[in-house]
């Protein structure tokens, strides 16, 4: 059962797993949610009645019954992890804590103009977990405007004390605001020879990489596969760090794989969701329960529905035993990973899907794209919306993309002459315009947010957000697309598609069925040669065939240029402008979304 409210002056008795320090009860709840075993917590706020050494303690707790006895205690705030809830969860914490000094290893000290600059520095430093900034009112003259970057083994402070005229806060890496590069490749036959900070068991290098990504101290990893010669090290995932943030030495070793934490682009990759099944593989761990199940999929469902279950092993039924049902072993461990992985015993293993909600919805795999043809099929582009105006009569105005449960990203030029959001309707999950009848459900628009530097499409800043009046319930036919990571600026996308109901040629009409076209990206240098009379800025991105023939056109504006990278779709561009449609040597020009990620997050995450 999901309990979101905090219990004031209440302490949960017993069940302690560990104690960490957090600046607020709200953040204690987030830490509990991300901890592999924590189901409940008790936080101690600052209070004259409490011993100052206990202020800001966050005690993480577990219970077989999923609850614990409650005791009244002043300044104690208790609550439950969000593991029991079905809503989306984020580790992003933008709060600034005034007059609090969050203690950790101070590894970098420099002058900063503001707390915001200090936080940005922390976000763009590979080691930084949190910071403390001494304001210009700080009593000690030589410490004024000093920005201390800090890290700890756990990612949370080792202590928190009251200190006048300082402010503290956390890195915004988990808010998708880091400019650090994301190295997504996994390097075969490679061992990174740097210091290990931890080790866990993992079934493959991808799970090892995801574990590294959400481990606070892990910057890169080495995984020994099941064919690794040393038996005791098979399936071992070594979590590593180094002073420089990069591996100092890489050694060639067969059957080992290495890679990097994807911390700074974790909003666009699955991190907690290990959805694969591992055949002929047994996961060992503490046994929670043994249940009969018809299949390994059914076993995974049982594990997902049992809040304490972290992983499972299913042993298929022997011929006619037990009505064809096999045994489903529900398991857990102290760190959420199997304590040992065995092969060749006939089991099928996997992980709970309960933690998938801790990943961005946009990372969910969608149904395979239909290759060939120009007409889309239902569910192929579930982020694509059709934006209608009702004035003077109802018609398709522009495309747009779902990027959050209340947000559509589109082009600013779509709103020329639109006086009020009241005349707009957003339809999602639509394949054919003919599906839209008077009684078709739509989302009303609460607010149109146009970039304040927008003047006209050709001069850039052609980007706008629509805030919906109600939230979108994600389904197979309507779900968000990931924003590109700032750390992926150097990625060369090779699988890009433009979609929309726009014209198929310059003099045409809006199409009934959603059209799609695969279009290669063109360098800005090349694009500039094709548009001598315009300035193609780095905030624009171009796509098109040299010979023309495929392009976006009138009515496609505001729609997505979607590119698939590492199995995840990213909103790389917004259809903006071009000379004619599909003309030879006239690529389409799109708003380069990666350059507006800060702007999008600022507007959509505003309190």
């Amino acid at each position: 059962e999901c309990v979101t409210q905090l219990l004031k002056d209440t302490c949960f008795e017993g069940g302690d797993i560990t104690t960490v320090f957090t600046p607020s009860a709200k953040y204690c709840q987030v830490v509990c949610t991300y901890h592999p075993r924590c189901l409940l917590f008790t936080f101690t706020a600052e209070s004259p009645s409490e011993d100052p050494t206990r202020w800001f303690t966050c005690v993480l707790k577990d219970s077989v019954t999923e609850t614990l006895p409650r005791v009244n205690r002043t300044a104690a705030i208790s609550g439950y992890s969000f593991k029991q809830c079905s809503h989306q969860i984020s580790a992003c914490n933008k709060d600034i804590y005034v007059d609090l000094d969050m203690k950790g290893i101070n590894y970098n000290s420099s002058v900063a103009k503001s707390a915001q600059e200090c936080q940005e520095r922390c976000t763009d430093d590979v080691h930084c977990h949190f910071f403390t900034y001494a304001t210009r009112q700080f009593p000690s003259l030589e410490h004024r405007n000093i920005c201390l970057l800090k890290h700890t083994q756990t990612g949370t402070p080792t202590r928190i004390t009251k200190l006048d005229k300082v402010v503290s806060g956390f890195s915004l890496k988990s808010c998708a605001l880091s400019n650090l590069a994301c190295i997504r490749d996994i390097f075969p036959n490679t061992v990174f020879a740097d210091s290990n900070i931890d080790s866990v068991m993992a079934p493959d290098a991808f799970v090892c990489g995801r574990i590294c990504t959400h481990h606070p101290g892990c910057l890169f990893f080495t995984f020994f596969s099941q064919e690794w010669p040393k038996e005791s090290q098979r399936n071992l995932c070594l979590l590593k760090t180094s002073e420089s943030g990069l591996p100092s030495t890489r050694i060639k070793k067969s059957k080992a794989l290495s890679g990097f934490s994807l911390q700074s682009c974790r909003h666009s990759i699955p991190v907690f969701c290990h959805s694969s099944f591992y055949h002929d593989t047994d996961f060992l761990g503490e046994e929670l329960d043994i249940v009969a199940a018809k299949s390994h999929e059914a076993c995974q469902k049982l594990c997902t529905n049992a809040v304490r279950c972290q992983f499972f092993t299913y042993t298929p039924a022997q011929a006619s035993c037990n009505e064809g049902k096999g045994k489903c072993y529900l398991k857990l461990s102290s760190n959420g990973s199997p304590t040992k992985i065995l092969h060749g015993r006939g089991g099928i293993s996997g992980y709970t899907l309960r933690l998938c909600k801790m990943d961005n919805e946009c990372t969910t795999k969608i149904k395979p794209r239909i290759v060939g043809g120009t007409a889309s099929v239902r569910g192929e582009w579930p982020w694509q919306v059709t934006l209608h105006t009702t004035s003077p009569t109802q018609r398709h105005l522009c495309g747009g993309s779902i990027i959050g449960n209340q947000w559509i990203l589109t082009a600013a030029h779509c709103f020329y002459g639109v006086e009020s959001p009241k005349i707009l309707r957003v339809y999602s999950g639509i394949l054919n315009q003919s599906e839209i009848k008077e009684d078709t459900s739509f989302f009303g628009v609460q607010e149109i947010i146009i970039h304040d530097q927008y003047k006209m499409a050709e001069s850039g800043y052609d980007i706008a957000l629509l805030k919906l009046e109600t939230t979108v319930n994600y389904t197979d036919s309507q779900r968000p697309i990931c924003l590109p990571s700032k750390g992926d600026r150097n990625v060369i996308y090779t699988d890009c598609w433009v979609t929309g109901w726009g014209y198929r040629k310059l003099r045409d009409k809006i199409q009934n069925t959603l059209q799609k076209a695969k279009i290669p990206l063109v360098t800005n240098e090349e694009c500039q040669k094709r548009y001598r009379g315009h300035k193609i800025t780095h905030k624009m991105i171009c796509a098109g065939y040299r010979e023309g023939g495929k392009d976006a056109c009138k009515g496609d504006s505001g729609g997505p240029l979607s590119c698939k990278h590492n199995e995840v779709w990213h909103l790389v561009g917004i259809t903006s402008w071009g000379e004619g449609c599909a003309q030879r040597e006239r690529p389409g020009v799109y708003t380069n979304v990666v350059e507006y990620v800060d702007w999008i997050l600022e507007k959509t995450q505003a309190v």
């Epitope: 650090l180 590069a181 994301c182 190295i183 490749d185 390097f187 075969p188 036959n189 490679t190 020879a193 990069l246 030495t249 890489r250 050694i251 060639k252 070793k253 067969s254 750390g487 150097n490 990625v491 060369i492």
Partner: antibody, heavy 121, light 107 residues
Framework: EVQLLESGGGLVQPGGSLRLSCAAS????????MHWVRQAPGKGLEWVSS????????DYADSVKGRFTISRDNSKNTLYLQMNSLRAEDTAVYYC??????????????WGQGTMVTVSS | DIQMTQSPLSLSASVGDRVTITCRAS??????LNWYQQKPGKAPKLLIY???SLQSGVPSRFSGSGSGTDFTLTISSLQPEDFATYYC??????????FGQGTKVEI
């Protein structure tokens, strides 16, 4: 034809700076690790620096660390080496080289023709 | 860092001779060893990678062998165009990528 073409070498005074470029053609540049290797007159080959395909990972020989910076622009198919605080011992022919596909051929399979850098007062 | 030691540093041979150059690593490098040929005023050219794999376009008279610490480059029948300097290089533990001092094959 697959090729690498270096430019930017020349005569420079000690303490001075120089920027070398290496233009790649005939292959898709972006997936490959790229390297700079130098050869002092009459001497053997010395590895200088390397850069990962997307540019987020660089390595340097101890002899140039803190003075040289490797970078790349995948949209221009070009590799760079910014050399600052140059010393007489940096005098050499500088080659750019492509590292072959990981796991199959990790050797430097394509080399440029080299560009001469002379550091002298 | 892994040190690479070549021997001999120079050798004289005639056309048609069988020539052997050895390279020793200061520690085991498995089979991650490459051989390059360099002619005066030219860039090095890859001959052999992974100790014994012949790079495409390289004549079959060139061959490589060895693993661990000791490696050999053999030219079965020396041709006029083979007079050059030969370098071994390890790619086992990097950075740095280290080269041998070179072996000059003279007429």
């Amino acid at each position: 034809e697959v090729q690498l073409l270096e430019s930017g070498g020349g005569l420079v005074q000690p303490g001075g700076s120089l920027r070398l470029s290496c233009a790649a053609s005939g292959f898709t540049f972006s997936p490959y690790w790229m390297h700079w290797v130098r050869q002092a007159p009459g001497k053997g080959l010395e590895w200088v620096s390397s850069i990962y395909s997307s540019g987020g990972w660089t390595d340097y020989a101890d002899s140039v660390k803190g003075r040289f910076t490797i970078s790349r622009d995948n949209s221009k198919n070009t590799l760079y080496l910014q050399m600052n605080s140059l010393r007489a011992e940096d005098t050499a022919v500088y080659y750019c080289a492509r590292e072959g596909v990981a796991g199959t051929n990790d050797a430097f399979d394509i080399w440029g023709q080299g560009t001469m850098v002379t550091v002298s007062s | 860092d892994i040190q690479m030691t070549q021997s001999p540093l120079s050798l004289s041979a005639s056309v048609g001779d069988r020539v052997t150059i050895t390279c020793r690593a200061s520690q085991s490098i498995s089979s991650y060893l490459n051989w390059y040929q360099q002619k005066p005023g030219k860039a090095p050219k890859l001959l052999i990678y992974a100790a014994s794999s012949l790079q495409s376009g390289v004549p079959s008279r060139f061959s490589g062998s060895g693993s661990g610490t000791d490696f050999t480059l053999t030219i079965s029948s020396l041709q006029p165009e083979d007079f050059a300097t030969y370098y071994c290089q390890q790619s086992y533990s990097t950075p740095p990528w280290t080269f041998g001092q070179g072996t000059k094959v003279e007429i």
